[in-house]
Interface confidence: low
């Protein structure tokens, strides 16, 4: 342990204010009381300290709270949060959504850092589930947050939280994640009428099973091609030409542009060419007349 230098006469800090930006590092160390700093943390953020000075202030807090900072200090860390390591954050017990918001605000505009990821992890684990308010907050700061969770983690999202999800929050989700989220969305929006329901459920349809797509085809929903292209291939394959036509409505013409891409390509291969011809789009690759079409599950059983 390095011997501590005494604070020069008249320099003892009575409060955390702008005069401290003119202190050298050793003067901050010697003249700022850690307990005073802890009680006036809210002032630190308004003062343009250098990063070296912030290191000194962090060191003082670390000495005062070796087991981890209390939430009253954490909430007012401001830019000092950027100095924290994931190891520091693992010692914290953050329970207030206001604290979480305050720290996310500091990191706003930056990519999600390891510190932020650790903070969110601590917060969510402390709450036991991703409730609506938390999800609302996290997706507001990080639209891709939901899709960064594993299917196992997503299983702890209650259906009520789904109301906080915006379409852009699901942009980077893969089919496994949508498989978990779709049933929750279906439950969350079950009491809405047809057209409103479709607007809400549309972003989640990448996790929808065949029977739900068949049901939607009966409701004049006019699904756009972008949504159709994100559907599970195994859910699309059993749909008939008539069902796809009803599902897409006026957008059915877009199938021609997508005929070489999944799931359209695979779906075409499963349809009778005669049925495809009824669409008048020039789709090719269907099953010629006179050929026997085996059910997909039978094909798998036979192979």
């Amino acid at each position: 342990e390095v011997e501590k230098t005494a604070c020069p006469s008249g320099k003892k800090a009575r409060e955390i204010d702008e005069s401290l930006i003119f202190y050298k590092k050793w003067e901050l160390e010697a003249c700022v009381d850690a307990a005073l700093l802890a009680t006036q943390m809210d002032r630190v953020n308004a003062i343009p300290f250098t990063y070296e000075q912030l290191d000194v202030l962090k060191h003082k807090l670390d000495e005062l709270y070796p087991q981890g900072y209390p939430e009253s200090v954490i909430q007012h860390l401001g830019y000092l949060f950027l100095k924290m390591s994931p190891e520091d954050i693992r010692k914290w017990n953050v329970t207030s959504l206001e604290t979480l918001k305050a720290l996310l605000e500091v990191n706003k505009g930056h990519e999600m850092s390891p510190q932020v990821a650790t903070l969110i992890d601590r917060f969510v684990k402390g709450r036991g589930q991703l409730d609506k308010d938390t999800l609302d907050t996290l997706t507001a700061f990080y639209p891709g947050y939901l899709c960064s969770l594993s299917p196992e983690e997503l299983s702890s999202v209650p259906p009520s939280s789904i109301w906080a999800v915006r379409p852009q929050d699901l942009d980077t989700c893969d089919p496994r994640q949508l498989d978990v989220l779709y049933p929750k969305a279906r439950l969350a929006f079950q009491n809405m009428n047809g057209s409103e329901y479709f607007v809400k459920i549309q972003s989640f349809l990448g996790g929808a099973p065949t029977e739900d797509l068949k049901a939607l085809s009966q409701q004049n929903v006019s699904m756009d091609l972008a949504t159709f292209m994100k559907l599970r291939t195994d859910a699309v394959l059993p749909l008939t030409v008539a069902e796809v036509q009803k599902l897409l409505g006026p957008h059915v013409e877009g199938l021609k542009a997508e005929e070489r891409h999944r799931p359209v390509r695979d779906w075409i291969l499963r349809q009778r060419q005669d049925d495809l011809d009824t669409l008048g789009l020039g789709l090719q690759g269907g099953i010629p007349n006179g050929y026997l079409v085996l059910d997909l599950s039978m094909q798998e059983a036979l192979s």
Epitope: N45, P48, F49, T50, Y51, L82, N107
Partner: nanobody
């Protein structure tokens, strides 16, 4: 690292005015604090004025009431309006930017201010 370029230095009579400018290569939204430092002949570089990302401004006692720091995030520029200049304001003036997350301070090359009595 942020690149900083100062301009506006030069010679002035005591009681006169100068405006120093500092243009940053990065968006000022990503900079946590900006400051003007000065160094008269000798090794010591002192902080003259600083502005935090929240817009809070601070001044060294020697320049309070005479100098004004400001910035414009859109043009990535910071200024130091220097009024009622004194011979003791003669120094090389440096623009500095703090990035707390990266733990970096970036410096400009400096601009010379000379005040004659």
């Amino acid at each position: 690292q942020v690149q900083l370029v100062e301009s506006g230095g030069g010679s002035a009579q005591a009681g006169g005015s100068l405006i120093l400018s500092c243009v940053a290569s990065a968006n000022l939204f990503t900079i946590d604090a900006l400051g003007w430092y000065r160094q008269a002949p000798g090794p010591k570089r002192e902080l003259v004025a600083a502005i935090s990302s929240g817009g809070n401004k601070y001044y060294a006692d020697a320049v309070k009431g005479r100098f004004t720091i400001s910035r414009d995030t859109l043009t990535k520029t910071m200024w130091l309006q220097m009024n009622n200049l004194k011979p003791e304001d003669t120094a090389m003036y440096y623009c500095a930017a703090e990035d707390y997350g990266l733990g970096q301070r970036s410096w400009g090359m400096g601009t010379q201010v000379t005040v004659s009595s």
